[in-house]
């Protein structure tokens, strides 16, 4: 669901504004990195610096939910196994990949099994 604007109370009994409404962090260039967040309170506006992380893991956050297949067999050559995820639900404004591939190292047990299988195949 598209996130509602975060509402932040401005402290201090003497402050004119009781509640600031902050918009999303908008990167200054491209779709991640340093940018600005605009806040409004009555007729007042403020801009504060913010950062949208550029790491690939962003696609795996709450913005994008995937339905994953079971893990594939261990690849003895790379020592990893793979599974694919299909997009299940995206936040309205989140530009999620339709499918993603996740890899992880094989456990020592599956590594040994994969090596044993490889060895048998060579005989």
């Amino acid at each position: 669901v598209a996130k509602k604007k975060d509402k932040v109370k401005k402290g201090g009994p003497g402050s004119e504004c009781a509640e600031w409404a902050w918009g999303p962090c908008t990167p200054s260039s491209k779709d991640c990195g340093v940018g600005f967040r605009e806040g409004t309170c009555g007729a007042q506006t403020q801009r504060i610096r913010c950062r949208v992380p550029c790491n690939w893991k962003k696609e795996f956050g709450a913005d994008c939910k995937y339905k994953f297949e079971n893990w594939g067999a261990c690849d003895g050559g790379t020592g990893t196994k793979v599974r694919q995820g299909t997009l299940k639900k995206a936040r309205y404004n989140a530009q999620c990949q339709e499918t993603i591939r996740v890899t992880k190292p094989c456990t020592p047990k599956t590594k040994a099994k994969a090596k044993a299988k490889k060895g048998k195949g060579k005989d």
Epitope: P24, T26, T40, K88, A90
Partner: antibody
């Protein structure tokens, strides 16, 4: 690519209800938000609300909270919008559209609902 | 709710001319602004998403700018098939809202 085919035109009497369907084919129906938009004759576009087929999460324009009910049937890849207590002001073309922030959207051909006594 | 004001209401141009359509939001909507084209008897067609992102299958003469409160749709050289009504829509907060439209007509 997604194709959306809507049900045919309807003529209803004031006070009646109508259920408009929107059948999807092509890419996964259940992954994308389904919007409903209306357009009165000679007027602009007005957003009614949306539903996500994966869990039926619904967000309605408050203006339509007592007017529209959105549902989906995953088994047939069909979205439905039921309009109740129809009035002449509800005469409009009603559109469904499947939205993905990554690829954009696809629209149905529209369903004309005429409310007349 | 966020109000989108489009200007001009009507734009009269000849084919080959440059079209500049404006959409102003009542508050900052980041880049969550989309442009649609609608021809009589047809469903709207998405031209630009998120202020400036192009859409597959849409001619390169259509471009958009933003973000913030002031957005522009530019048609670099108007073709005969571009005469239609253009709407902007915001998806920054609920309810989603559309502008009142700009009618691009032949001069």
């Amino acid at each position: 690519q997604v194709q959306l085919v809507q049900s045919g035109a309807e003529v209803k009497k004031p006070g009646a209800s109508v259920k408009v369907s929107c059948k999807a084919s092509g890419q996964s129906f259940s992954s994308y938000w389904m919007n409903w938009v209306r357009q009165a004759p000679g007027q602009g576009l007005e957003w009614i609300g949306m539903i996500h087929p994966s869990d039926s999460e619904t967000i309605l324009n408050q203006k339509f909270k007592d007017k529209a009910t959105l549902t989906v049937d995953i088994s047939t890849s069909t979205a439905y919008m039921e309009l109740s207590s129809l009035r002449s002001e509800d005469t409009a073309v009603y559109y469904c559209s499947s939205w993905s922030a990554k690829r954009g959207d696809f629209w149905g051909q529209g369903t004309l609902v005429t409310v007349s006594s | 709710e966020i109000v989108l004001t489009q200007s001009p209401a009507t734009l009269s141009l000849s084919p080959g001319e440059r079209a500049t359509l404006s959409c102003r939001a009542s508050e900052s909507i980041s880049n969550n602004l989309h442009w649609y084209q609608q021809k009589p008897g047809q469903a709207p067609r998405l031209l630009i998403k998120y202020a400036s992102q192009s859409i597959s299958g849409i001619p390169a003469r259509f471009s958009g700018s933003g973000p913030g409160t002031d957005f522009t749709l530019t048609i670099s050289s108007v073709e005969p098939e571009d005469f239609a009504v253009y709407y902007c829509q915001q998806s920054n907060s609920w309810p989603l809202t559309f502008g009142g439209g700009t009618k691009l007509e032949i001069k």
